[in-house]
């Protein structure tokens, strides 16, 4: 008798590979067992399976669940096996050893080739998937960075607003003191019933051209209603304007005498009409005090 097999078995990746080993013997000859092994491993042969006439198919632990017999009907002289779901690591040399009675043992060797077939459409689909996945990842990262930026900006703006409010409060306190001192002095020097309290003066900071409002359209940057978010610079400028208009000396002790003199001089140039202070008619209608401040 003799063994029928193939020199090379070619299978597509993921498909089942049939490893053929058929004993063509004389009548009355029997196959006792067929041992399949992988034989290109450096450490020696590695058993795949043993097909035994009495005990049936025994798959080696190393190939558990991966080796089967071909579907029925089965010829008792057929020692072929199926290697399930071939992977590239399965590519290599295999042999079957057939023990027969009474003819003895036979062996055959074959090479298993595992082909990797790439479908061009599938491949482009995978590329598209990869690109879209990359875009999503980049988008997510960008969004996270933007959120981080927004948080930083919000925290910074809150910090600056708090600082600005503190400064405004401080200046307003100073301003109030200055105003009270000015009014007191005004009453003590000029007991003229026409003199009006400070609130009557028709000069308002809000109308000053330096009153810079933050009209930014970024809603994240402004938590207050539009037009209420003042920059630190604007707030300081407004306070400076008010201070300069109402009390050039801003209430410091070393300048009190200068300030008294300035108020006296100023009152000589204004006249009370209909509850409002109006400038007395002069050559140019502008009064500049001794310190050079515009009033």
């Amino acid at each position: 008798g003799e063994l029928e097999t193939s020199d090379v078995v070619t299978v597509v990746l993921g498909q089942d590979a049939k490893l053929p080993c058929f004993y063509r013997g004389d009548s009355g000859e029997q196959v006792g067992q067929v041992a399949w092994a992988r034989v290109d491993a450096g450490e020696g042969a590695q058993e795949l399976a043993l097909l035994h006439s009495k005990y049936g198919l025994h798959v080696s632990p190393a190939y558990e669940g991966r080796v089967e017999q071909p579907p029925p009907p089965r010829n008792p002289l057929d020692g072929s096996v199926l290697l399930r779901n071939a992977v590239q690591a399965d590519e290599g040399e295999y042999e079957c050893r057939v023990s027969t009675f009474p003819a003895g043992s036979f062996q055959a060797r074959l090479r298993l080739r595992v082909l990797v077939v790439l479908d061009p459409q599938e491949d482009s689909g995978k590329q598209v998937d990869l690109v879209s996945a990359s875009v999503v990842v980049v988008g997510v990262i960008a969004a996270l960075l933007f959120c981080l930026l927004v948080v930083v900006v919000v925290l910074m703006s809150r910090y600056h607003r708090r600082k600005a409010q503190q400064m405004t409060q401080k200046y307003e306190e100073e301003l109030t003191l200055t105003r009270e001192n000015s009014i007191r002095r005004l009453h003590s020097h000029h007991t003229d019933p026409r003199s009006q309290p400070e609130e009557s003066v028709g000069l308002r900071a809000e109308g000053h051209p330096d009153s810079l409002k933050d009209n930014s359209s970024c809603s994240v940057m402004s938590e207050e209603p539009e037009g209420r978010s003042y920059s630190t610079l604007t707030t300081v400028r407004e306070i400076e304007t008010q201070t300069e208009l109402l009390s050039p000396g801003s209430g410091r002790a070393e300048e009190e005498e200068d300030q008294d003199e300035g108020i006296k001089q100023a009152m000589n140039h204004f006249v009370q009409e209909n509850g409002t202070l109006r400038a007395k008619p002069t050559g140019n209608g502008i009064y500049i005090n001794g310190r050079g401040h515009l009033v």
Epitope: G32, Q33, A35, A37, V39, D40, A41, E43, G44, A45, Q46, E47, L48, L50, H52, Y55, H58, V59, S60, P61, A62, Y63, E64, E93, E95, R97, S99, G104, S105, Q107, R109
Partner: antibody, heavy 120, light 111 residues
Framework: EVQLQQSGPDLVKPGASVKISCKAS????????MHWVKQSHGKSLEWIGR????????SYNQKFKDKAILTVDKSSTTAYMELRSLTSEDSAVYYC?????????????WGQGTLVTVSA | DIVLTQSPASLAVSLGQRATISCRAS??????????MHWYQQKPGQPPKLLIK???NLESGVPARFSGSGSGTDFTLNIHPVEEEDTATYYC?????????FGGGTKLEMK
């Protein structure tokens, strides 16, 4: 380190049964056949059979087909061999053994052996 | 079953000399890839120890003074130079088919 630890010696009466254990450690228990080998005093070695720890499937030397039953307990990574209807001929040292690599041939690792003495 | 016949049954060799042990199989155990024959050493009270696998491949950790050769049905184990610690019984074993079988053993002693 691969280790095969066998149960201690047994003295049993003729006609009785004995169950020898082989506790495996240091490797993937389900990745290798467990073989059993008999050595009578002053004599050569005889291969009894092998068991696949994955599914409990076993192959036997026809001479021991009615004498030995090979089983495994995956949870405890232990292989067992039960010897039935014992006679004085069954007095011997029994070894469990493992192949060098998964599915390769030859016995690279051996248990220390279990001496079974059958005596009235 | 494949029968393995070892010779001689016992052997006495002087230290430093060569010891040669033969094993004959009742049928060929060789393919175009490998010979399915292995050699073991066993000392009293110990389990066997694998020396040579696939007729000529030295097992890891085994001294190079051990070597194996042969194919088909005739195989040889050589020990050279023999050392005191090599006193033991040596067995051949095939794994061509089930049942695997062992040779009768060769007892090596020092002169």
């Amino acid at each position: 380190e691969v280790q095969l630890q066998q149960s201690g010696p047994d003295l049993v009466k003729p006609g009785a049964s004995v169950k020898i254990s082989c506790k495996a450690s240091g490797y993937s228990f389900t990745g290798h056949y467990m073989h059993w080998v008999k050595q009578s005093h002053g004599k050569s070695l005889e291969w009894i059979g092998r068991v696949n720890p994955n599914n409990g499937g076993s192959s036997y030397n026809q001479k021991f087909k009615d004498k030995a039953i090979l089983t495994v307990d995956k949870s405890s990574t232990t292989a067992y061999m039960e010897l039935r209807s014992l006679t004085s001929e069954d007095s011997a040292v029994y070894y469990c053994a493992r192949d060098p690599l998964g599915g390769s041939y030859g016995f690279a690792y051996w248990g220390q052996g279990t001496l079974v003495t059958v005596s009235a | 079953d494949i029968v393995l016949t070892q010779s001689p049954a016992s052997l006495a060799v002087s230290l430093g000399q060569r010891a040669t042990i033969s094993c004959r199989a009742s049928q060929s155990v060789t393919t175009s890839s490998y010979s399915y024959m292995h050699w073991y050493q066993q000392k009293p009270g110990q389990p066997p120890k694998l020396l040579i696998k696939y007729a000529s491949n030295l097992e890891s950790g085994v001294p190079a003074r051990f070597s194996g050769s042969g194919s088909g049905t005739d195989f040889t184990l050589n020990i050279h130079p023999v050392e005191e610690e090599d006193t033991a019984t040596y067995y051949c074993q095939h794994s061509w088919e089930i049942p695997y079988t062992f040779g009768g053993g060769t007892k090596l002693e020092m002169k």
